[in-house]
């Protein structure tokens, strides 16, 4: 692999990371917008930080940091930055794989935990504005009502529920959506993992090439 290959590798890594950095900026920006303008509220009282805005801000920030390391490491041919980029991608990849395995193994436990959290939040609907905002947003957006159905609202469905007839529950609808789109979710997840592995491979190859080039030049 010569100087031309090194240049190609360097610019491929740079441009792809620049693209991801821009995406990260957009995600972060959207997250900040949600935090400022849209009060989707808090659905799980035991996880008050788990809001749509916070999720976007965290994901956007991680993408930006990783992509920045990739951009700067490749364009400056900085081994330290490239290794940091490689290690961060490895940590993210391992975390994703671990999370996927845990979700698969503990799906039933997770379902029970989420259902319990949602039941608790239904009881807080009339007393907590943040919970009310969260439920109203979800019920209006998904055209659903309650957890498993309209009857979950034992003291009557709120105005955000479809009023004319009973509809399926929001959790039931979300689970159904996930199950019916399982193939697409799987493909997207695999694509993300492949991109991460490619990024790691490129970073490692570029790192090795920097070493070889340095030796060839006699540094």
């Amino acid at each position: 692999m010569g100087m031309s290959s090194l240049k190609l590798l360097k610019y491929v890594l740079f441009f792809f990371n620049l693209l991801f950095w821009i995406c990260g900026c957009c995600i972060l920006g959207f997250g900040i917008y949600l935090l400022i303008h849209n009060n989707f509220g808090v659905l799980f009282h035991n996880l008050p930080s788990l809001t749509l805005g916070n999720v976007f801000v965290i994901v956007g920030s991680i993408i930006m940091v990783v992509a920045f390391l990739g951009c700067m490491g490749s364009i400056k041919e900085n081994k330290c930055l490239l290794m940091s980029f490689f290690i961060l991608l490895l940590i993210i990849l391992l975390a994703e794989v671990t999370l996927a395995i845990l979700l698969f193994v503990y799906e039933q436990k997770l379902n029970e935990y989420v259902a319990k959290g949602l039941t608790d939040s239904i009881h807080r609907y009339h007393s907590d504005n943040s919970t009310k905002a969260a439920w109203d947003s979800i019920q209006s957006f998904l055209q659903c009502c309650g957890i498993n159905g309209t009857s979950d609202w034992t003291s009557g469905p709120p105005a955000s529920c479809p009023s004319d007839r009973k509809v399926e529950g929001c959790y039931a609808k979300a689970r159904l959506w996930f199950h019916s789109n399982f193939l697409y979710i799987g493909i997207i997840t695999i694509c993300v993992c492949v991109i991460e592995v490619l990024g790691m491979s490129f970073a490692l190859t570029l790192n090795c090439q920097i070493d070889k080039t340095s030796q060839t030049i006699g540094l």
Epitope: D136, Q139, S140, F141, Q143, G149, T150, S151, W153, T154, S155, G156, A159, S160, P162, S163, D164, R165, K166
Partner: antibody, heavy 111, light 112 residues
Amino acid sequence: QLQQSGAEFVRPGASVKLSCTASGFNIKDDYIHWVKQRPEQGLEWIGRIDPANGYTEYAPKFQGKATITSDTSSNTAYLQLSSLTSEDTAVFYCVWHWDYWGQGTTLTVSS
Amino acid sequence: DIVMTQAAFSNPVTLGTSASISCSSYKSLQHNNGITYLYWFLQRPGQSPHLLIYRMSNLASGVPDRFSGSGSGTDFTLRISRVEAEDVGVYYCAQMLERPFTFGTGTKLEIK
């Protein structure tokens, strides 16, 4: 389909309980509504019940006048009307899912 | 309560031609979820009412596709493309956005 109880002829001041039995579907799957139609007039929504949890809602006009109940074991809903006057002379329909209407129960209040 | 307004009678129509029945509400019947909660019912002489159109434009099961519903948030129209003798009766619009649900006074379809 929805099968309603037969015509009722009652005295003013009395109470009456109308029934509505469903067949071919489970009433728990949607609301049961009751609708009033006075002779040669339009339709008025009395109220509804969610048979799955017993929750009821009434139009303000019928609050205190009407009581809606249900029995899921017999797939039946009920409408009880109290302190009857000539104004209560009407046909009462039970409705499920807004798709299924009973044949109507004629209530005549007269002395 | 949301008041629903309807004309008592339609313009007399000839069998086989189209007819339109109008209905209006004093406030928008469109929910935050984008659905417009306007229903149409037909009550034939001596019968119980039955559902024709739900949520403004959806045809109820078993209803011929001669019937169609349209409208904005406050003004609604029921169209019958080719009127048949069995379409005679009183047409009621109803709002299902807020409790108490309210019906229009009904429009009687007249045949020439």
